[in-house]
Interface confidence: low
């Protein structure tokens, strides 16, 4: 499973996002996409 | 404009201590996501620690290589990241590079340093 | 760690032709990969997030494509300033980690 920290939000968000990761439903900046460095 | 500018790099003996700083500017430091990543001459890039924004509670990852010795911290009312380390090994010379990252969702940002040099030798 | 294995180690091509970059990793990273272009004495700037997205300011000639644990980095048409290092990286797991670098050099 993915253990990140981009992960944990990322299940607790809950739904995909064009980033490859997931992100809230609203329009509040979140980081949770999928982590680049 | 966006700036980072890291510091703090320098010639140390084995067992010695450093601290390397990066100054932030032209961006919402406090919402950006900060891993240190170090490349040794000639080879290829290591990620080496990252601390999250202060709203995921700054909370910090550490690779084993460099756990228990090197302490990744943020101050951002300075705008500024650090890296502590400690017990420095030859090992640890390595161009080191501050990148903060920030997603938007739909988009992301991604910074990076110049990087500074740090050589471990006697 | 999730190891991530590029080649080949080295390309040798010319202003024009197509590149074509494999990154494979040792255990499923779903799609979070991304490439990096390194030039001498510059640091790392990112090319491609989530596998397959297209960084700021990025050209359209660069794209990525993969899931799982095969993803590649294709340069449609090489241009003379794209001739760098290439790394691909994960974040799937900790420690995040990079691939040993692919040589993209002119022919």
């Known amino acids: 499973a993915c253990d990140t920290a981009t992960c944990v939000t990322h299940r607790l968000a809950g739904l995909l996002s064009r980033s490859g990761g997931v992100v809230k439903n609203n329009f509040v900046p979140t980081n949770v996409g999928s982590k680049a460095f | 404009e966006v700036q980072l500018v890291e510091s703090g790099g320098g010639l140390v003996q084995p067992g010695g201590s450093l601290r390397l700083s990066c100054a932030a500017s032209?961006?919402?430091?406090?919402?950006?996501?900060i891993s240190w990543v170090r490349q040794a001459p000639g080879k290829g890039l290591e990620w080496v620690a990252e601390i999250r924004s202060e709203s995921d509670a700054s909370a910090t990852h550490y690779a084993e290589a460099v756990k228990g010795r090197f302490t990744i911290s943020r101050d951002n009312a300075k705008n500024s990241l650090y890296l502590q380390m400690n017990s420095l090994r030859a090992e640890d010379t390595a161009v080191y590079y501050c990148?903060?990252?920030?997603?938007?969702?739909?988009?992301?940002?991604?910074?990076w340093g110049q990087g500074t040099l740090v050589t471990v030798s006697s | 760690e999730i190891v991530l294995t590029q080649s080949p180690a080295t390309l040798s091509l010319s202003p024009g032709e197509r590149a074509t970059l494999s990154c494979k990793a040792s255990k499923r990273v779903t799609t979070y990969v991304s490439w990096y272009q390194q030039k001498p004495g510059q640091a790392p700037r990112l090319l491609i997030y989530g596998a397959s997205n297209r960084y700021l300011g990025i050209p359209a000639r660069f794209s990525g494509s993969g899931s799982g644990t095969d993803f590649t980095l294709t340069i449609s048409s090489l241009e003379p300033e794209d001739f760098a290092v290439y790394y691909c990286s994960q974040s799937y797991n900790y420690p995040y980690t990079f691939g040993q670098g692919t040589k993209l050099e002119i022919k």
């Open positions: 990148n903060c990252y920030f997603d938007y969702g739909l988009a992301i940002q991604n910074y």
């Open positions: 032209g961006f919402t430091f406090s919402n950006y996501w």
